[in-house]
């Protein structure tokens, strides 16, 4: 974690855990107020690299639900709708953070995990090729 | 959250937060040993639909650093390098989880928060209005 | 059960024309991509041409480019593969092959082969 | 094109044993890979795809896996039946490229 000067309204951290164990409010807060998270929702169609998502669930993480892109094809799409095999469809990877419960079952302890899942598709060339 | 039974090994819970405030572990436990987090990095330049990457920097937040993508076109790019407008470039976006310290410059209390970003960008066909 | 039969080889001489034929059963047909492999006489596999589900999409090698066409009857179960300007290193085992999605990338289903000898 | 390269050519081995084939792709092909088993007479046959996707109907003790260009197929506990050549095949890139195989013979 990053140092930083603790304020005198600080929880207290005399803990022997501190700095491995902090405590966090679940109550989330979003920013995205101002955003339609809608708004992509088509793209997964509309796309010349298009995905399925594909529902992943497991009651001992948090969030318990995330969507997985699976594109649909290994080319891309061409404007007639067939494929381009001069073209990849690939997916765009992120690593995000999720709380797994720690012990597992356990309601108000958990533990953090980087997951990598697939958000979408883009469509690449296969090579690159190097200018000498 | 979702109601599980509490295993009798579990952290003690009787707290007037609780279930609003629970431990976390930072000690990351990270999941994807098995996957390469490189495979994916040159597909933004690659991309039909490329895109820069934007360091998102806010010490108050974990993770402090998040990369944002912008994509470079308003259209996709061709096979020839030129820009085809009758395409479009559009960003990914997914909603992550981080935490936010709280109260400010607490080392040990945060809160979860929900922000959007812009993973990658794809290259969709644009809707079309037609007007009757 | 999935069956590839391919059909239409034989001796032709270099310059010569021929036309394959690869009649499928067990399957549709229609919503598969399907391809022209060769084994060459020294084992080599090589690429001929893929066709995608609806025939709106092919693709060929530089080796056989404007010498092979590659079609396909939806309506009869049937692929083709027309060659022309044919040459000795054309002389090969050729398999008919059935790719597990619309278009054309890897195969899971292969015919028996027919054989090609291109020679005078 | 790329080029995919079965550096043994053939090796004989006993019954039971483990047997590595490699496969080395000249330029990265993202895990888009096949491996086929072939026999004397046969067409080939599709054992794996996406580089460690075991297909349907494939015995277990076959396996596939990755290490940057590097792609290898794993046979364990080798039975009299896996005596064949087996090719590699790339489908990142057209035109699609094979290896030019690995012939297995049992001792």
């Known amino acids: 974690g990053i140092a930083i000067p603790r304020n005198s309204g600080c929880p207290n951290s005399e803990d022997k855990n501190f700095p491995r164990t902090v405590m966090v409010n679940l109550n989330i807060h979003n920013r995205n107020t101002s955003t339609n998270p809608k708004r992509s929702s088509d793209y997964y169609n509309r796309s010349t690299s298009p995905w399925n998502l594909h529902r992943n669930e497991d009651p001992e993480r948090y969030p318990s639900v995330i969507w997985e892109a699976k594109c649909r094809h290994l080319g891309c799409v061409k404007a007639d709708g067939n494929v381009d095999y001069h073209m990849n469809s690939v997916p765009i990877q992120q690593e995000i953070l999720v709380l797994r419960r720690e012990p597992r079952h356990c309601p108000n302890s958990f533990r953090l995990e980087k997951i990598l899942v697939s958000v979408g598709c883009t469509c690449v060339t296969p090579i690159v090729h190097h200018v000498a | 959250g979702i109601a599980i039974p509490r295993n009798s090994g579990c952290p003690n819970s009787e707290d007037k937060n609780f279930p609003r405030t629970v431990m976390v572990n930072l000690n990351i436990h990270n999941r994807n040993t098995s996957t390469n987090p490189k495979r994916s990095s040159d597909y933004y330049n690659r991309s039909t639909s490329p895109w820069n990457l934007h360091r998102n920097e806010d010490p108050e937040r974990y993770p402090s650093v998040i990369w944002e993508a912008k994509c470079r076109h308003l259209g996709c790019v061709k096979a020839d390098g030129n820009v085809d407008y009758h395409m479009n470039s559009v960003p990914i976006q997914q909603e992550i989880l981080v935490l936010r310290r709280e109260p400010r410059h607490c080392p040990n209390s945060f809160r979860l928060e929900k922000i959007l970003v812009s993973v990658g960008c794809t290259c969709v066909t644009p809707i079309v209005h037609h007007v009757a | 059960e999935v069956q590839l039969v391919e059909s239409g080889g034989g001796l032709v001489q270099p310059g010569g024309s021929l036309k394959l034929s690869c009649v499928a059963s067990g399957f549709t047909f229609s919503t598969y991509g399907m391809s022209w492999v060769r084994q060459t006489p020294d084992k080599r596999l090589e690429l001929v041409a893929i066709?995608?589900?609806?025939?709106?999409?092919?693709f060929y090698p530089d080796s056989v480019k404007g010498r092979f066409t590659v079609s396909r009857d939806n309506a009869k179960n049937t692929l083709h593969l027309q060659m022309s300007s044919l040459k000795s290193e054309d002389t090969a085992m050729y398999y008919c092959a059935r790719d597990p999605r619309h278009d054309g990338y890897f195969f899971d289903y292969w015919g028996q082969g027919t054989t090609l000898t291109v020679s005078s | 094109d790329i080029q995919m390269t079965q550096s043994s050519p053939s090796f004989s081995v006993s019954l039971g044993d483990r047997v590595t084939i490699t496969c080395k792709a000249s330029?990265?092909?993202?895990?888009?890979l096949a491996w086929y088993q072939q026999k004397p007479g046969n067409a080939p046959r599709l054992l794996i795809s996406g580089a460690t996707s075991l297909e349907t109907g494939i015995p277990s003790r076959f396996s596939g896996s990755r290490s940057g260009k590097d792609y290898t197929l794993d046979i364990n506990s080798l039975q009299t039946e896996d005596a064949a050549t087996y090719y590699c095949?790339?489908?990142?890139?057209?035109?699609?490229?094979f290896g030019g195989g690995t012939k297995l013979e049992i001792k």
């Open positions: 066709i995608n589900h609806n025939g709106g999409s092919t």
């Open positions: 330029e990265d092909i993202y895990d888009r």
């Open positions: 095949q790339q489908y990142w890139s057209v035109p699609w490229t």
